[in-house]
């Protein structure tokens, strides 16, 4: 039986240019967290195996880094980067569980970099 | 087998600036952090920051930024830390660790930085 | 930045003990929480992820719960393999932080 539940940032907005952690968190479950997937919409941006490490897909690879943790950290934002993102945790033995997140980039004149990581 | 070579004992002026380095082998260099950790004789362990290979993302502790700058060679697996204007708090050893998203499961020996006149 | 306080800072114990260490975090940080073992002259060894999450190749007396705040790293009856010093960290946000950690001594 899947006792687990996945808590999300939910709907959040963020800034063009800016950038943005995508967090998902697996609770109410002693399942092994075997893999997480991170999706925008039927899109894969990123996976977090337990024994391969992240893998960043080749089209995100510049604009994404990975974590803090099992999140994912989003920046350069642009306006095309609104709408839903998943994170898929594949657990054992309870199976797959999903989360979904929102995310709306907004127009501004002063983008705002949040994040403290840097892609050089 | 997962291993993180470190480099050896450094001895240093204050002032000075040294470089170490965290070999790794056994995985895919590119898809873990490469994490700084200070530990002080007799102390706890200090996170300094995290070094990812796969596209050259950094984080640091605030506290160590113009302290340690994070850099890795990928095609020789390698990371490397520089501490510059050392003083007699840089004196410590200095571990890297590897995290691919689930905690920090694989560390180096540790490396020995003596900073005396 | 995220403060973990571990406690006690010293824990005596006997072989054949069962103990609590205690890891407090300034803020909910879920369970995105790690225990790390040390002992004297080696590198640190995680010991349990994601607060409950087993490692392979840990003892089954090692075990970790809590979520939000308030953090617990169980042994169940202590062996003598098993002194040292004790680190919790958290992965929720950065920068990364470890708590000051305890140390688990032979009473």
């Known amino acids: 039986m899947m006792t687990g539940t996945i808590e999300t940032t939910g709907n959040i907005s963020a800034e063009k240019g800016g950038s943005i952690i995508l967090q998902c968190h697996l609770s109410s479950t002693t399942a092994q967290v075997t893999q997480v997937n991170w999706e925008q919409q039927d899109q894969l941006l990123a996976i977090c195996n337990a024994d391969l490490g992240w893998h960043i897909s080749p089209s995100f690879k510049d604009r994404v880094a990975p974590g803090p943790g099992l999140g994912l950290t989003l920046q350069s934002l642009t306006v095309n980067d609104t709408g839903e993102y998943f994170c898929i945790y594949h657990t054992y033995p309870d199976g797959t569980y999903t989360g979904r997140i929102f995310l709306e980039v907004l127009e501004s004149s002063v983008a705002e970099h949040g994040a403290r990581f840097q892609i050089p | 087998e997962v291993q993180l070579q470190q480099s050896g004992t450094v001895l240093a002026r204050p002032g000075a600036s040294v470089k170490m380095f965290c070999k790794a082998s056994g995985y895919s260099f590119t898809s873990y952090w490469m994490h700084w950790v200070k530990q002080r004789p007799g102390q706890g362990l200090e996170w300094i920051g995290a070094f990812y290979p796969g596209n050259s993302a950094t984080n640091y502790n605030q506290k160590f930024k113009g302290k340690a700058k994070l850099t890795a060679v990928t095609s020789a697996s390698t990371a490397y830390m520089e501490l510059s204007s050392l003083t007699n708090e840089d004196s410590a050893v200095y571990y890297c660790?590897?995290?691919?998203?689930?905690?920090?499961?694989?560390w180096g020996q540790g490396a020995s930085v003596t900073v005396s006149s | 930045d995220i403060v973990l306080t571990q406690s006690p800072a010293t824990l005596s114990v006997t072989p054949g003990d069962s103990v609590s260490l205690s890891c407090r975090a300034s803020q909910s940080i879920r369970n995105n929480l790690h225990w790390y073992q040390q002992k004297s002259h080696e590198s640190p060894r995680l010991l349990i992820k994601y607060s409950s999450q087993s490692i392979s190749g840990i003892p089954s007396r090692f075990s970790g719960s809590g979520s939000g705040t308030d953090f617990t790293l169980s042994i169940n009856s202590v062996e003598t393999e098993d002194f040292g010093m004790y680190f919790c960290q958290q992965s929720n946000s950065w920068p990364y932080t470890f708590g000051g950690g305890t140390k688990l001594e032979i009473n």
């Open positions: 660790s590897r995290e691919g998203g689930y905690g920090m499961d694989h």
